[in-house]
């Protein structure tokens, strides 16, 4: 194994794959078909599966921008430098174990994945082997937003984006030079992982809701 | 090459404090998940916590209010402050840095030499 | 609180021999669990992640199987380097539990 600088593997693996290594949505592979015995999955188990897809599909688009540029040798330092305003977890979010608020983490996970979704819209031409994983991903975040907004409660609280708002930082991203662009996709991929790492972390926290059936891999 | 140094450990007494550090050469850390891990003399791993990049904590049940991990990526060090010691918190502890694709699955990979902490009168 | 169990507590085998150590989760954890190596008065080592994948440098002979509650690992062939204790830890969640490896085998010399 070799790794990139963010401590990635970039050579593991990738999950719900199939025969042509493409990321298959969970649900939709061979496996899960061929499984009449296995118990319907609990919408915790959904949203837990969709965000580990999601995640393998990251690690994937990881793989190919770390292979075609340096970008993942640069330092946090120099990546701060670039000013885009990608959504974080803070403890103030509820999603940590520390100060922990099931509703307001909720709402900040639904918020922060809608307010990712002009950056996923910015990845689909970003990358040519990984065309396909880039779509998948963008896609799977859209439905696993379907699956949280079923979830949560306090529907009003989430604010979502304003579309000429998105359609203006879109152009202006897409407006970059090519150092710039490599250094965004590299930021946005990096930050999504981290938010839906922290989103996870979060969603097992809910009363430890979420327990994957035994053979759902 | 990377490497993990752990200081601070010593004989305190029961009731005491004591900050552990773990300074890390070769790598930026702020691109890591970090670990704190203890064995007691003869006994096997006990693992104390974890922070993550997005600076989140999480502590084992026994360690939550006594224990408090942080980190300062500018300096390139993880720390853990122990509090209110007893005789069992007696052991080597060990950092860690991890990497981790889900959630909590993060694969310990590097590990300090460790720093003993006796806590006894 | 998810809880990891490993068996046997203590092995006792000669070289050649083929070794298996189980580690049993109170709950489903898919395959996020990794195996650990360790040697009387050193820091451990990972041999394996995501159930059955070998980290880089770690001898074939060693491999991981399992998912959901039932992990194995296996020395096909033991060495003498190879008499250490082993951990599994578990990485499903870290919420709400004591801890998250499981209480170690020794794997001595017969």
């Known amino acids: 194994d070799y790794k990139d600088h963010d401590g990635d593997y970039k050579d593991h693996d990738i999950d719900y794959k199939d025969d042509d290594d493409k990321l298959v949505p969970p649900g939709e592979d061979s496996k899960d078909v061929a499984a009449p015995h296995r118990q319907p999955l609990t919408s915790s188990e959904r949203i837990d599966k969709q965000i580990r897809y999601i995640l393998d599909g990251i690690s994937a688009l990881r793989k190919e921008t770390c292979n075609k540029s340096n970008m993942c040798e640069s330092s946090k330092e120099a990546l701060a430098e670039n000013n885009l305003n990608l959504p974080k977890m803070a403890e103030k979010d509820g999603c940590f174990q520390s100060g922990f608020n099931e509703e307001t983490c909720l709402v900040k996970i639904i918020t922060g994945l809608l307010e990712f979704e002009v950056y996923l819209e910015y990845l689909q031409n970003r990358f040519e082997s990984s065309e396909e994983q880039a779509r998948a991903v963008q896609m799977s975040t859209k439905v696993l937003i379907q699956f949280l907004q079923k979830k949560a409660k306090n529907l009003d609280a989430i604010t979502t984006p304003d579309p000429t708002t998105n359609a203006s930082l879109l152009t202006k991203l897409q407006a970059q030079n090519q150092w710039l662009q490599d250094m965004t996709t590299h930021l946005i991929l990096r930050s999504f992982k981290e938010f839906l790492q922290s989103s996870l972390r979060a969603l097992r926290q809910m009363g430890d809701l979420i327990s994957v059936p035994v053979d759902s891999r | 090459e990377v490497q993990l140094v752990e200081s601070g450990g010593g004989l305190v007494q029961p009731g005491g404090s004591l900050r552990l550090s773990c300074t890390v050469s070769?790598?930026?850390?702020?691109?890591?998940?970090l670990s704190w891990v203890r064995q007691a003399p003869g006994k096997g791993l006990e693992w104390v916590g974890y922070?993550?990049?997005?600076?989140?904590?999480w502590y084992a049940n026994w360690a939550k209010g006594r224990f408090t991990i942080s980190r300062d990526n500018s300096k390139n060090t993880l720390y853990l402050q122990l509090n209110s010691l007893r005789a069992e918190d007696t052991a080597v502890y060990y950092c860690?840095?991890?990497?981790?694709?889900?959630?909590?699955?993060?694969?310990?990979?590097?590990w300090g030499q460790g720093t003993l902490v006796t806590v006894s009168s | 609180d998810i809880q990891l169990t490993q068996s046997p507590s203590f092995l006792s085998a000669s070289v050649g021999d083929r070794v298996t150590i189980t580690c049993q989760a109170s709950?489903?954890?898919?395959?996020?669990l990794s195996w650990y190596q360790q040697k009387p008065g050193k820091a451990p080592k990972l041999l394996i992640y995501?159930?059955?994948t070998l980290t880089s440098g770690v001898p074939s002979r060693f491999s991981g199987s399992g998912s959901g509650t039932e992990f194995t690992l296996t020395i096909s062939s033991l060495q003498p380097e190879d008499f250490a204790t082993y951990y599994c830890?578990?990485?499903?969640?870290?919420?709400?539990?004591?801890?998250?490896f499981g209480g170690g085998t020794k794997v001595e010399i017969k």
């Open positions: 860690a840095r991890g990497s981790t694709d889900y959630a909590f699955d993060t694969r310990l990979d590097l």
């Open positions: 070769g790598i930026d850390l702020s691109s890591y998940d």
């Open positions: 922070i993550y990049t997005d600076s989140s904590t």
């Open positions: 709950q489903s954890i898919s395959n996020e």
């Open positions: 995501r159930a059955s």
């Open positions: 830890q578990q990485g499903y969640n870290s919420n709400d539990v004591d801890n998250v």
